[in-house]
């Protein structure tokens, strides 16, 4: 079974800069999985942000504009990355990755 690790416990960024979060997949080939990213803002329910499927297809939360969250997958390091562009106060949250095994 696949296992996920998010090596960064926290990330502090200046407003308008870029934050890059990592999710390391082990126990399964990342190319045979779909990786999902969620966020939990303080006092709010967890929210789906974006996913990247085994074939590279990206789906995003329809209410968030393109260009805000960028998801990628690096097979060589078995890592999925979530890049948050133009960091602002509403991005303060806990971010989670999740795995769907195909």
């Amino acid at each position: 079974a696949g296992h996920l690790e998010q090596p960064q416990i926290s990330s502090t960024k200046t407003l308008s800069k870029t934050a890059r979060l990592e999710c390391v997949v082990s126990g399964i080939t990342i190319s045979a999985t779909s990786v999902y990213w969620y966020r939990e803002r303080p006092g709010e329910v967890i929210q789906f942000l974006v996913s990247i499927s085994y074939d590279g297809t990206v789906r995003k939360e329809s209410g968030i504009p393109s260009g805000k969250f960028e998801v990628d997958r690096i097979p060589e390091t078995s890592t999925s990355t979530l890049t948050i562009h133009n960091v602002e106060k509403q991005d303060i949250a806990t971010y989670y990755c999740a795995l769907w095994e195909v």
């Epitope: 990247i52 590279g56 297809t57 990206v58 329809s62 504009p65 393109s66 260009g67 562009h85 509403q90």
Partner: antibody, heavy 118, light 108 residues
């Protein structure tokens, strides 16, 4: 059927203001991000602004920042672009657009022409 | 800002021929975030390809996309009369979203 119907384009003097509207139907407007894209005569496409479903996220191209304001009314299922301090470089056909389920800008309005005269 | 440069500016071909359009980025673009649009005179653009190579709904299979990093290509395998138009590439991974300048495919 997704429909985006635009209005508000006009001839305006340099330094003037204009408000564009985009009336949406055929989908749950309050669930989707919306965009404005423009095209100057004989030129390429230029992204102008984006707004999230609940107006949480708003982005502008540097060329319009501080002059243009994007907004939406989810109850009226409408998108707006308030354009102030217009200059000749803002003359273009303005399109509103919505993403598809997978791809960007899958649905477009018919376009509305803004002409700025000196 | 990612600058997209399309070439050639104009491509003159005959129906039935193969068209190859290029889109070059000033910095690396994820393959998940590169799209192509077709635009005919007086009309709004139409999404053809997203995620570098996935065809949008209703797009015929003579249209295909490929590439990675900074170099992307749209190929029309056999030009039909209705394919003569302007084609735009777009990167939508990071704000500001940026379009290329367009390539016009016209009849030789």
């Amino acid at each position: 059927e997704v429909q985006l119907v635009q209005s508000g384009g006009d001839l305006v003097k340099s330094g003037g203001s204009l408000r564009l509207s985009c009336a949406a139907s055929g989908f749950t407007f309050s669930s989707y991000s919306m965009y404005w894209v423009r095209q100057a005569p004989g030129k390429g496409l230029e992204w102008v602004s984006s707004i999230g479903s609940s107006s949480t996220y708003i982005f502008y191209a540097d060329s319009v920042k501080g002059r243009f304001t994007i907004s939406r009314d989810n109850a009226m299922t409408s998108l707006y672009l308030q354009m102030n301090r217009l200059g000749a470089e803002d003359s273009a056909v303005y399109y509103c657009a919505r993403d598809g389920e997978l791809g960007p800008f899958e649905y477009w309005g018919q376009g509305t022409l803004v002409t700025v005269s000196s | 800002e990612i600058v997209l440069t399309q070439s050639p500016g104009t491509l003159s071909l005959s129906p039935g021929e193969r068209a190859t359009l290029s889109c070059r980025a000033s910095q690396s673009v994820s393959t998940s975030y590169l799209a192509w649009f077709q635009q005919k005179p007086g009309q709004a653009p139409r999404l053809l390809i997203f995620g570098t190579s996935s065809r949008a709904t209703g797009i015929p299979d003579r249209f295909s996309g490929s590439g990675s990093g900074t170099d992307f290509t749209l190929t029309i395998s056999r030009l039909e009369p209705e394919d003569f138009a302007v084609y735009h590439c777009l990167q939508y991974g990071r704000s500001p979203l940026t379009f290329g300048g367009g390539t016009k495919v016209d009849i030789k």
